[in-house]
Interface confidence: medium
């Protein structure tokens, strides 16, 4: 990605998805009535013109928000503590890598303004998730719906990262 972001960042992202998958406590089919469209802002991760600063900031904000969401007393009561601890550790490592990267990307002169809008959009999206959990009184089904939603949005975000990496490889080989 043109900065000191370790090659294993993609692996760490996949590990986060694996952990979220393992955290499942009840069948999603028991929670169909609790489903909610949180309207993940897909336009942020689906574009073909991917800027490094944009990708970094989306991933950083995404991970920061996931960390914040699963780093509360409410989530400690809802999930397996060992898996939760592994999730926190993995997210923390990824965030540290991305912060180093982000500062370098901004230093290289990529628009810092381009970095703020995804952050704002994602914060609003996660606020909606928090409102939903509160509305549902942090029920097991509400947390299950949220776990599934986070997996979906994280998958889309890491796909975006892979597309940027592929683009960089193509440019490097041409």
């Amino acid at each position: 990605l043109g900065c000191d972001l370790p090659q294993n960042h993609g692996l760490l992202s996949r590990n986060t998805l694996v952990l979220l998958h393992q955290m499942r406590r009840i069948s999603p089919f028991l929670c169909l009535k609790d489903r909610r469209d949180f309207r993940f802002p897909q336009e942020m991760v689906k574009g073909s013109q991917l800027q490094k600063a944009h990708v970094m900031s989306v991933l950083h904000e995404m991970l920061q928000q996931i960390f914040s969401l699963f780093h509360t007393e409410r989530s400690s009561a809802a999930w397996n503590m060992t898996l939760l601890d592994q999730l926190h550790t993995g997210l923390h490592q990824q965030l540290q890598h991305l912060e180093t990267c982000l500062l370098q990307v901004v230093g290289e002169g990529e628009s810092a303004g381009a970095i703020s809008s995804p952050a704002l959009t994602l914060r609003r999206y996660f606020q909606g998730i928090r409102v939903y959990l509160k509305e549902k009184k942090y029920s097991d089904c509400a947390w299950e719906v949220v776990r599934m939603e986070i997996m979906k949005s994280l998958f889309l975000s890491t796909n975006m990262q892979e597309r940027l990496r592929s683009k960089d490889r193509d440019l490097g080989s041409s």
Partner: antibody, heavy 123, light 112 residues
Framework: EVQLQQSGGDLVKPGGSLKLSCAAS????????MSWVRQTPDKRLDWVSI????????YYPDSVKGRFTISRDNAKNTLYLQMSSLKSEDTAMYYC????????????????WGQGTSVTVSS | DIVMTQAAFSNPVTLGTSASISCRSS???????????LYWYLQKPGQSPQLLIY???NLASGVPDRFSSSGSGIDFTLRISRVEAEDVGAYYC?????????FGSGTKLEIK
């Protein structure tokens, strides 16, 4: 007690530069996003810039983009606003403000404001 | 940019009676997440602004429950149920839905 102590305001000529400071105390500065907001002589409030807690994200409205730079030193608990190519329309009282980001809500409401520092751009 | 519109002055009110201050945005501030990103600030004479209301209807810490706010997404009203002398000042609405964040021009609360 949360406090935001501002300094650096002055009378400056058009085209000149100025650096404002905002020293924070009474809270964990590195955990909060911060903004600069100015109040023009006609008492209008005009949002000038934002910086997130770690300093990774910044944003400026078009009126100041390319001329103003917001930065922070979390080790010194201080927020800065570097202003250059100043114009007469930049004349205002400048306030630093803390974003209410408690409880994981990441709200951008400004819950604490500094006392303000006056910037006058005039020849 | 989202434009926030306010009248310069409120209708003069008598102490102890209720007052209403209006604000209108050029775009709905209701996000798809169900939150309305409308805020109210009060600037008392000679002081810095202070937060009164966040996300349209939530009272900020330390704000007396004489204050309340409601709205439709575009039209908003701040109500003070029993006006006190210390409520005098300029009331600003603001939006944090989109960058750049914008403020209304402020409404001065007038006491009869």
């Amino acid at each position: 007690e949360v406090q935001l102590q501002q300094s650096g305001g002055d009378l400056v000529k058009p085209g000149g530069s100025l650096k404002l400071s905002c020293a924070a105390s009474g809270f964990t500065f590195s955990s909060y996003g911060m903004s600069w907001v100015r109040q023009t002589p006609d008492k209008r409030l005009d949002w000038v810039s934002i910086i997130t807690s770690g300093g990774s994200y910044t944003y400026y409205p078009d009126s100041v983009k390319g001329r103003f730079t917001i930065s922070r030193d979390n080790a010194k608990n201080t927020l800065y606003l570097q202003m250059s190519s100043l114009k007469s329309e930049d004349t205002a009282m400048y306030y630093c403000a803390r974003h209410a980001e408690g409880g994981g809500n990441y709200d951008y409401a400004m819950d604490y404001w500094g006392q303000g520092t006056s910037v006058t751009v005039s020849s | 940019d989202i434009v926030m519109t306010q009248a310069a002055f409120s209708n003069p009110v008598t102490l102890g009676t209720s007052a209403s201050i209006s604000c209108r945005s050029s775009k709905s501030l209701l996000h798809s997440n169900g939150i309305t990103y409308l805020y109210w600030y009060l600037q008392k004479p000679g002081q810095s602004p202070q937060l009164l209301i966040y996300q349209m209807s939530n009272l900020a810490s330390g704000v007396p429950d004489r204050f309340s706010s409601s709205g439709s997404g575009i039209d908003f009203t701040l109500r003070i149920s029993r006006v006190e002398a210390e409520d005098v000042g300029a009331y600003y609405c603001a939006q944090n839905l989109e960058l750049p964040f914008t403020f209304g021009s402020g409404t001065k609360l007038e006491i009869k």
